[in-house]
């Protein structure tokens, strides 16, 4: 009774990659350890059969599937995926294992399925069974985290209603401005959904589960700061919950804090104080000014006013929907080879959006950051100085807005060429758009400057790639030029590059570059 | 490498709560094919399965035990939380926490890993 | 709660025996029974799932047999690291319930 070859089979998840097809590989890419699959013999079936456990995949999401074989000796091996072979290469490793992956890049719905995966070895045959589904994240949202306070404590609550249920945190700074960045030193994470430390600085509080991370800022105006230049401004949609933190901190307990809405005291039961002694024994008190449901009739100025301190004011605006303002007319820009260069996009919303950058049919990161005027800006420096189209999308629970750009990098012709037994053409991809010339070299004209005007046919822009033009020009074959060597030029303001041709009967052509500048 | 560890305090006192913390390795609690149990141990006795819990939060308890019980995950941690209510002296036990895999032809993966386990001891 | 019955509670066996344990189910559970080896001082190790299939890595010389509520695991050939307490669990219905548990001592 022969001894079951141990098999391990594992899913490896990979930060995710530029393409887009399923392979066989021996070497995945670097990733994230393995995750075991639990291989077993399926029960009740007729041969060898092991199956691992289902997977479920994120579209777009890079995976290696992998089975490790203990058995004496070498193996072969072949993959199937819905009638079709694939190529399988098993390796080593250093335990002396064997080794094969399946590497599925930028998973799609096609690329759902049963892999079955057949292995050869010296003592015995045996096929393994890995089941790939596409996520279902129809069914998952991610809102955006709102306070509550908590009954009969002076402590606020976290709530983001969520699925799959997310992982609240509260995300304190104590200092001021840059050092408050997520990664710096000066900021304190805490893992909970009651916080009762409400005196700090900066206060977020941030919602995260498998489709991201959302965070809400405690709107906080502090009395000892300069007030900004533009008045702070917070949009609310009907129903959301308001909270408003005024601050302020005193030699001593002398002072009080109070809340107007348009010159009206707010009512009892829409604010709550706290106060504290701080290190240097001077007194900080603050100031909560709530709404849980707000209505069309709570919008207008909230103004914090203190014994010892000048008042500030906020502007709050209740809108009944969500919002994304900015200018969506397209933007032209041409730059030289090397000048540093970014796009950007100024816009106000609410709720915050969530944004990308798009070049190519390829998504890139967005980043926004909020200026002191209500507005928030988003840049895109990563072009690499390739000319084309970029996108700006944003979106939010309510709108959406897209803005295209063009980008034109400033360089001299680079000229292709080919020929066919009736016409010869080239291309460039030069901008400005360049103009073309063709010349004919003879005996009488060695240096080719005898130019061709017959049979010239150009195209300013005969194909778009990914929004990069593309110019043209074709030479039709006359008697007059057939066996001679012919040049083509393109030239613009930044130079003029060239290719000569020999027309020759059908067969292969050489061509020489030329490159003037 | 799959692994399970399960951390939590060796003495508890009557009436208080026992709450233990299995933290994985190697495989992924968001795999809708993955689940942890929960079973324990009394000192040369049977095991007793107490709790399971899936990727989308389904939970399952022992008949016997379920008003004292609460299953609980997070995926981020790779951890999975038991609390246990009211603890007696009968509740002395080594506690495992163990893996069920499921697969295309059923949930037949019952148990394939545990941890070492942990001896609570329930005295006053 | 289905009650799962194991016998014999031990059994003492020399090395190169056939040992066979017995599990019933108090009612049928079709194929969904487990096999498990406990040493003393370490947790459980499965032997066999869905009633007879090995796991892997195991030794061939355990086996599992049976369907519905008669279940045997077998040791064709007792090795001087089987002598051990095995179990078996059912997870059928809710809650999971676990056999008794056999002994196997050296005679």
């Known amino acids: 009774n022969q001894d079951l070859p141990v098999i391990k089979c594992v899913l490896i998840n990979h930060k995710n990659n530029d393409s887009s097809v399923g392979k066989s590989s021996s070497y995945p890419m670097v990733s994230e350890s393995p995750e075991d699959l639990g291989c077993a013999l399926r029960p009740q079936s007729s041969g060898t059969v092991y199956e691992a456990a289902a997977v479920e995949v994120d579209v777009s999401a890079s995976i290696t599937l992998q089975v490790l074989v203990d058995a004496p000796g070498n193996i072969s091996c072949l993959w199937v995926f819905k009638h079709s072979s694939l190529n399988c290469q098993p390796h080593f490793d250093l335990q002396n294992r064997g080794v094969v992956s399946m590497v599925i890049l930028k998973m799609t719905e096609t690329q759902a399925g049963e892999y079955l995966l057949f292995i050869q070895s010296e003592a015995t045959n045996y096929t393994i069974l890995f089941t790939v589904s596409i996520r279902n994240t129809l069914l998952y949202t991610l809102r955006r985290p709102y306070f509550r306070k908590m009954e009969n404590q002076d402590a606020l609550v976290c709530i983001s209603e969520s699925v799959p249920e997310p992982i609240v945190e509260w995300v304190l700074c104590d200092s001021q401005g840059e050092s408050c960045k997520e990664e710096s030193p000066a900021v304190v994470k805490k893992e909970e959904k009651v916080l009762h430390e409400l005196f700090g600085t900066d206060i977020r509080c941030c919602a995260r589960n498998e489709l991201g991370r959302e965070c809400t800022r405690l709107f906080t105006i502090d009395l000892n700061q300069t007030p900004q230049t533009t008045l702070p401004q917070l949009f609310l949609k009907v129903g959301e919950p308001l909270w408003i933190r005024c601050k302020a901190v005193h030699v001593n307990h002398g002072f009080g804090l109070t809340w107007e809405l348009e010159n009206k005291a707010l009512e009892e039961g829409n604010y709550f104080e706290m106060s504290t002694y701080s290190t240097n024994r001077t007194m900080i008190r603050i100031l909560f000014a709530f709404v849980s449901s707000v209505a069309r009739n709570d919008t207008g100025y909230y103004t914090c006013s203190s014994s010892k301190h000048p008042s500030q004011s906020a502007l709050v605006t209740i809108v009944e929907k969500g919002f994304i303002n900015a200018t969506n007319s397209s933007e032209d820009y041409e730059i030289d080879q090397y000048e540093e260069f970014c796009f950007s996009v100024r816009f106000k919303a609410y709720p915050q959006i969530r944004c990308t950058w798009t070049f190519s049919r390829k998504s890139f990161p967005c980043e926004q950051k909020g200026l002191d005027n209500g507005y928030s800006i988003s840049k895109f420096c990563n072009h690499k100085h390739q000319p084309g189209e970029y996108i700006f999308h944003a979106e939010n629970d309510d709108a959406q807005f897209t803005k295209m750009f063009t980008l034109n990098i400033r360089r001299k012709p680079q000229v292709l060429a080919e020929a066919s037994a009736s016409q010869a053409s080239c291309f460039s991809d030069g901008y400005p758009l360049p103009s073309w010339t063709w010349k004919k070299c003879s005996d009488k004209s060695p240096n080719c400057t005898e130019e061709i005007t017959e049979g010239v046919w150009n195209r300013k822009a005969n194909r778009k790639v990914f929004g990069q033009w593309v110019s043209s020009s074709t030479l039709n074959m006359s008697e007059a030029i057939k066996g001679f060597l012919v040049k083509c030029c393109a030239y613009n303001s930044l130079g003029t590059s060239c290719e000569t041709i020999l027309l020759n009967s059908p067969g292969p052509f050489p061509f020489i570059q030329d490159n003037i500048s | 490498q799959v692994t399970l560890k399960e951390s939590g305090p060796v003495l508890v006192k009557p009436t208080e709560t026992l709450t233990l913390t299995c933290t994985v390795s190697?495989?992924?609690?968001?795999?809708?094919?993955?689940?942890v149990s929960w079973i324990r141990q009394p000192p040369g006795k049977t095991l007793e399965w107490l709790a399971h819990?899936?990727?989308?939060?389904?939970?399952s308890y022992s008949t016997s035990l379920k008003s004292r019980l609460t299953i609980s995950k997070d995926t981020s941690k790779s951890q999975v939380v038991l609390t246990m209510t009211n603890m007696d002296p009968v509740d002395t036990a080594t506690y495992y926490c163990?893996?069920?895999?499921?697969?295309?032809?059923?949930?037949?993966?019952?148990?394939?890993?545990w941890g070492q386990g942990t001896l609570v001891t329930v005295s006053s | 709660d289905i009650q799962m019955t194991q016998s014999p509670s031990s059994v003492s066996a020399s090395v190169g025996d056939r040992v066979t344990i017995t599990c019933r189910a108090s009612?049928?559970?079709?194929?969904?029974l487990a096999w498990y080896q406990q040493k003393p001082g370490k947790a459980p190790k499965r032997l066999i799932y869905?009633?007879?299939s090995l796991q892997s890595g195991v030794p061939s010389r355990f086996s599992g047999s049976g369907s519905g509520t008669e279940f045997t695991l077998t040791i064709s050939s007792l090795q001087p690291e089987d002598f051990a307490t095995y179990y078996c669990?059912?997870?059928?219905?809710?809650?999971?319930?676990f056999g008794g548990g056999t002994k196997v001592e050296i005679k």
């Open positions: 669990l059912q997870h059928n219905f809710y809650p999971l319930t």
């Open positions: 009612q049928d559970i079709r194929y969904d």
């Open positions: 163990a893996r069920i895999v499921g697969y295309g032809s059923g949930w037949y993966g019952y148990f394939d890993y």
């Open positions: 190697g495989f992924s609690l968001r795999n809708a094919r993955m689940a």
């Open positions: 869905a009633a007879s």
């Open positions: 819990i899936f990727s989308n939060d389904e939970k």
